[in-house]
């Protein structure tokens, strides 16, 4: 019995729970999901069942060995799995358990301007990085083009000074999550601070 | 990658015996059943038993009992099979292959197969 | 000894074809059958085990089914590289397994 093994996967993707034994004469193996019995084998019997039926079509074991394979992962199973194998060799049965956290691939973040002021030709705001859906698990970076240097930003707040007359930059928010990363539409100083003169509060994609 | 290699065609004069090997190489020998199969000419596939190679437990068909003796050697990876009393009946293919784990009667790697021919 | 039977002993299909292969336990074996394919001078490949999964890198045309006494493999579009003896084996319990002695698959 190990410690716990967390795993990570995405929505519609597969993962597989890694599980070996060097017990020659495994009577049973039970594998279950949140306490709810997933998938029970008795490998000298041959038979493999899984509890419920929807699951069947999910459910596979590489290469023929006691590692499970579970596919079309969907957000809901994100938890605790555990698995028991039972021998009359074995004292009391090995066991492991694992940690899944099922992650959606995120789609395009959503950038939304805040209150804006112009002041002695110098454009002061702050963009706000979001996901529309709520994802979890996920970080914000901001990367600012355009001047000598390049520049990053951490968290989902940018906030931008800009001077007229300065050149262009360009500000690209980078969502990221443990399976995928996308990126906002760029989004240009020169017309963010042109357009939102009369709209202080505009929100854009 | 997981591969057995079986030994050579033998041709046996009847009453002799045989020894067929089969090296393995690519997983963990020890731990894995390892079974032997014939495929007569014109016959079905008839499971002749299988060994697992950690304590040299051997489980047989009883139709084999007496004529087929499996061995396993953990220092080469190798599993053996042997053959007494030869008879023309005995003349044909015969296979070493891996069981699965997780349906230990289910084989998912195979040798390319022996020919034993027993003729006067 | 449980007995394998298999039907049909051979078989005329083209390639598209959707192909059905049975096999018949004399007793009941729950799910532990395995079906092989082999080609001539080759030795048994495993397609699969357990009555209903697909091992390894088997294209999924492949599909087992059944359980109890009777057992189904089909291949839903017959391709050119299909063309061989498709066998059942029971893997239940006890051994001694047994096979069914073959289904040979050939052109039309």
């Known amino acids: 019995s190990g410690p716990v093994k967390e795993l990570v996967g995405s929505v519609g993707g597969a993962v597989t729970f890694p599980l070996k034994s060097k017990v020659k004469q495994v009577d049973s193996i039970v594998w279950t999901f949140n306490t709810t019995p997933l998938v029970t084998i008795q490998p000298e019997g041959g038979t493999i069942i899984v509890t419920q039926n929807r699951n069947r079509e999910r459910v596979d074991f590489p290469d023929g060995g006691y590692s499970l394979k579970l596919s079309k992962l969907k957000k809901n199973d994100s938890g605790i799995y555990y698995v028991g194998i039972y021998s009359s060799s074995l004292q009391q049965p090995s066991t492991q358990e694992y940690v899944l956290h099922v992650y959606e691939h995120l789609s395009k973040p959503k950038v939304t301007m805040g209150l804006q002021s112009n002041k002695n030709g110098t454009c002061v705001t702050n963009l706000t990085c979001c996901m529309e859906h709520g994802e979890e698990d996920v970080i914000y970076t901001w990367k600012a083009l355009g001047q000598a240097a390049n520049e990053s930003h951490n968290g989902s707040i940018l906030p931008i000074s800009w001077r007229w007359g300065e050149s262009d930059m360009t500000f690209i928010c980078v969502a990221r999550n443990p399976v995928s990363r996308n990126f906002s539409s760029p989004i240009l100083a020169r017309k963010l601070c042109e357009g939102a003169a009369d709209d202080p509060d505009s929100s854009m994609v | 990658q997981v591969q057995l290699v079986q030994s050579g065609a033998e041709v046996k004069k009847p009453g002799a015996s045989v020894k067929v090997s089969c090296k393995a190489s690519?997983?963990?020998?020890?731990?894995?059943?390892m079974n032997w199969v014939r495929q007569a000419p014109g016959q079905c596939l008839e499971w002749i038993g299988r060994?697992?190679?950690?304590?040299?437990?051997?489980k047989y068909n009883a139709k084999f009992k007496g004529k087929a003796t499996l061995t396993a050697d953990k220092s080469t990876s190798t599993a053996y099979m042997e053959l007494s009393s030869l008879r023309s009946e005995d003349t044909a293919v015969y296979y070493c292959a891996r069981s699965t784990m997780i349906a230990t009667g289910a084989m998912d790697y195979w040798g390319q197969g022996t020919l034993v021919t027993v003729s006067s | 000894d449980i007995q394998m039977t298999q039907s049909p002993s051979s078989l005329s299909a083209s390639v598209g074809d959707r192909v059905t292969i049975t096999c018949k336990a004399s007793?009941?074996?729950?799910?532990?059958v395995a079906w092989y394919q082999q080609k001539p001078g080759k030795a048994p490949k495993l397609l699969i085990y357990?009555?209903?999964y697909r091992y390894t890198g088997v294209p999924d045309r492949f599909t087992g089914s059944g359980s109890g006494t009777d057992f189904t493999l089909t291949i839903s579009s017959l391709q050119p590289e299909d063309f061989a003896t498709y066998y059942c084996?029971?893997?239940?319990?006890?051994?001694?397994?047994?096979f069914g002695c073959g289904t040979k698959v050939e052109i039309k």
């Open positions: 690519g997983y963990a020998f020890s731990s894995s059943w």
């Open positions: 084996q029971q893997h239940y319990s006890t051994p001694p397994y047994t």
């Open positions: 007793q009941d074996v729950s799910t532990a």
């Open positions: 060994i697992y190679p950690g304590d040299a437990d051997a």
């Open positions: 357990s009555a209903s």
